[in-house]
Interface confidence: low
């Protein structure tokens, strides 16, 4: 099929970075500035993406590949190929229609993006809360209350390391 196609289509041998120019008897012409073709046999070149405003250029456009954008500091990418930039928030916050808002009690966000998520419910796994959650951090679940009952063996955590020459307070 490919051989048949190439016999029928004089444009099929135009390589990536060029286009088959119908205005010049279908010879291969290089893509004009600020355009590209990533595959051979193209009848037109695509316009390069321009990383403007909140977008910044991560990879320049070439004759064979489109530019790639990311977001300026204070923003992060959303969507395929970074089609949108969304404002960062602080840890412990989420972005709403009214801007960055603190996570509600019982929820946390440990990133500058995304939504606040509920703390882990330790009791669902039969465990107890070892470290309370905050707006920025999830709770830390510890051993189950049964594991801590008298007579049950428990692993003693290692003593914190101290610098030599310092006695315990």
């Amino acid at each position: 099929f490919e051989r048949t196609r190439s016999l029928q289509d004089p444009c099929s041998n135009c390589p990536a970075g060029t286009f088959c120019d119908n205005n010049r008897n279908q010879i291969c012409s290089p893509c004009p500035p600020n355009s590209f073709s990533s595959a051979g046999g193209q009848r037109t070149c695509d316009i390069c993406r321009q990383c403007k405003g909140v977008f910044r250029t991560r990879k320049e456009c070439s004759s064979t590949s489109n530019a790639e954008c990311d977001c300026t500091p204070g923003f992060h990418c959303l969507g395929a190929g970074c089609s949108m930039c969304e404002q960062d928030c602080k840890q412990g916050q989420e972005l709403t229609k009214k801007g960055c808002k603190d996570c509600c009690f019982g929820t946390f966000n440990d990133q500058k993006r995304g939504i606040c998520r509920p703390w882990t419910n330790c009791s669902l796994d039969g465990k107890s809360v070892l470290v309370n959650g905050t707006k920025e951090r999830d709770v830390v679940c510890g051993p189950s209350p049964a594991d801590l009952s008298p007579g049950a063996s428990s692993v003693t955590p290692p003593a914190p390391a101290r610098e030599p020459g310092h006695s315990p307070q």
Epitope: K52, G74, C85, K98, G99
Partner: nanobody, 121 residues
């Protein structure tokens, strides 16, 4: 009704400074992103700077380090402080209300009428 009223334009010598203001009304100012654009004679309108509801800012490469965008939510006003002005900064400067805080190449929902800045010796 959304209204954007620019002021502060004028004639200034190269190296000089100007402060443009854009007084906004008719919408909830503090939760919206605002931008400044400019159009030089015979050229297309181009992005200059934007400021988002959280006060994050973005600048065109050509004005970085010389222009500063700021906002006063209490006064519903956005400002463009321009310094080290050059002849190529001569243009009509437009205030724009951007579409939300999620931005795809800042798209403008509403424009002001513009204020002329002329930089010449």
């Amino acid at each position: 009704e959304v209204q954007l009223l620019e002021s502060g334009g004028g004639e200034v010598q190269p190296g000089g400074s100007l402060r443009l203001s854009c007084a906004a009304s008719g919408f909830s100012f503090s939760i919206n992103a605002m931008g400044w654009y400019r159009q030089a004679p015979g050229k297309r309108r181009e992005f200059v700077a934007a400021i988002y509801s959280g006060s994050s800012t973005v600048y065109a490469e050509s004005v970085k380090g010389r222009f500063t965008i700021s906002r006063d939510n209490a006064k519903n006003t956005v400002y463009l402080q321009m310094s080290s002005l050059r002849a190529e900064d001569t243009a009509v400067y437009y205030c724009g209300l951007l579409k939300g805080n999620r931005v795809v190449s800042p798209s403008v929902a509403y424009w002001g009428q513009g204020t002329l800045v002329t930089v010449k010796p």
